[in-house]
């Protein structure tokens, strides 16, 4: 025998109190799949969260973090403080990158500079707290009169592009 509730579409619930009639989800609730016996309460984006997408009868609200914070976890479960480039967020707060490491983003930890010599290249531009070193041609390629030219910064660094 087919369950009468299976006919209830997303945005409704199967109301046992009303002879298993499909009733619309009450305000501030939703059902994202059919055949639900209850509607779920909409997520509220408060405090460090702000609403990215409003709740509808068929979809939960989506939150994002306010300025100065970034999301962690699926569906932005938690907001974590941004640091400045050149810093990393430790469990004790934002801390400058140690010498020999860099962070060009507002999140994550400081990464060791590239060691150009491992690939037989020379350092063209020194690293900073905010930028990796730039490797140039191998030392043998730099004849005495050749000039080292600092190239323009790349248009896109890892981590900055959308998926």
């Amino acid at each position: 025998l087919q369950d009468p509730c299976s006919n209830c579409p997303a945005g409704t619930f199967c109301d046992n109190n009303r002879n298993q009639i499909c009733s619309p989800c009450p305000p501030n609730s939703f059902s994202s799949a059919g055949g639900q016996r209850t509607c779920d309460i909409c997520r509220q984006c408060k405090g460090v969260f702000r609403t990215r997408k409003e709740c509808s009868s068929t979809h939960n609200a989506e939150c994002e973090c306010i300025e100065g914070f970034h999301c962690l976890g699926p569906q932005c479960t938690r907001c974590e403080k941004d640091c400045r480039p050149g810093q990393e967020l430790t469990k004790k707060g934002c801390k400058d990158c140690c010498f020999g490491t860099f962070n060009d983003q507002k999140r994550g930890i400081c990464r060791p500079w590239t060691n150009c010599s491992l690939d037989g290249k020379s350092v063209l531009v020194n690293g900073t707290k905010e930028r990796d070193v730039v490797c140039g041609p191998s030392p043998a390629d730099l004849s005495p009169g050749a000039s080292s030219v600092t190239p323009p910064a790349p248009a896109r660094e890892p981590g900055h592009s959308p998926q």
């Epitope: 962690l72 990393e88 430790t90 469990k91 140690c98 490491t101 962070n103 983003q105 999140r107 994550g108 930890i109 400081c110 990464r111 060791p112 590239t114 060691n115 491992l118 690939d119 990796d132 070193v133 730039v134 490797c135 790349p154 896109r156 660094e157 890892p158 981590g159 900055h160 592009s161 959308p162 998926q163």
Partner: antibody, heavy 120, light 110 residues
Framework: QVQLVQSGAEVKKPGASVKVSCKAS????????MHWVRQAPGQGLEWMGW????????NYAQKFQGRVTMTRDTSISTAYMELSRLRSDDTAVYYC?????????????WGQGTLVTVSS | SYVLTQPPSVSVAPGETARITCGGD??????VHWYQKKPDQAPVLVVY???YRPSGIPERISGSNSGNTATLTLSRVEAGDEADYYC????????????FGGGTQLIILG
């Protein structure tokens, strides 16, 4: 969707070199660092190094320095790992794995692995 | 370089809770990631940054990290959870930034 597809199994003689490829799709290749990790038979996971596909900058685990070279070809969204002077204990499955967009988090997508067998 | 220590194996009956530990000096100050590795399959990230699950990972998998020990907890374990589990951290201060624990084989009894 994000996919990393690696080249097929290789059999090499001791002293030879092997070059494993990892073709990325479903995202901007130059936007995410690529790491290489290996697992020898009956052993655990071992991190080998990373490459920044945008600049070509690399960092290798000290154990592999002088024997490993990581490169990329941005025109075909492919990363490469070359290991030279192979020994029998380099027999392992080699994986490429993508960093999720910032350093300090877990490696979120992995290739299927490439078995490299070193045998005389 | 930094060392992560895991027990070689953990055995648990179906439906019970498995706890896999990962020890390291002041590991609580680092961000720990956990991977599940099944034979002939690529590793899968199951927990990142101590306690966050990537989408698609069930809620019964959780992580915690403080002091000198990080813990991966699998509640209501199923036969499909049988695998090797590896903890991992990044250690920028060493010449080997990517560090994995030795791995723990989760054995489902019965």
């Amino acid at each position: 969707q994000v996919q990393l597809v690696q080249s097929g199994a290789e059999v090499k003689k001791p002293g030879a070199s092997v070059k494993v490829s990892c073709k990325a799709s479903g995202y901007t290749f130059t936007g995410y660092y690529m790491h290489w990790v290996r697992q020898a038979p009956g052993q655990g996971l071992e991190w080998m190094g990373w490459i920044n596909p945008n600049s070509g900058g690399t960092n290798y685990a000290q154990k592999f320095q002088g024997r490993v070279t990581m490169t990329r070809d941005t025109s075909i969204s492919t990363a490469y790992m070359e290991l030279s002077r192979l020994r029998s204990d380099d027999t392992a499955v080699y994986y490429c794995a993508r960093e999720p967009g910032y350093y300090g988090s877990g490696l979120d997508y992995w290739g299927q692995g490439t078995l490299v067998t070193v045998s005389s | 370089s930094y060392v992560l220590t895991q027990p070689p194996s953990v055995s648990v009956a179906p439906g019970e809770t498995a706890r896999i530990t990962c020890g390291g000096d002041d590991i609580g100050d680092k961000r720990v990631h956990w991977y599940q590795k099944k034979p002939d399959q690529a590793p899968v990230l199951v927990v990142y940054e101590d306690r966050y699950r990537p989408s698609g990972i069930p809620e019964r998998i959780s992580g915690s990290n403080s002091g000198n020990t990080a813990t991966l907890t699998l509640s209501r374990v199923e036969a499909g959870d049988e695998a090797d589990y590896y903890c991992q951290v990044w250690d920028s201060s060493s010449d080997h930034p990517g560090v994995f624990g030795g791995g723990t084989q989760l054995i489902i009894l019965g």
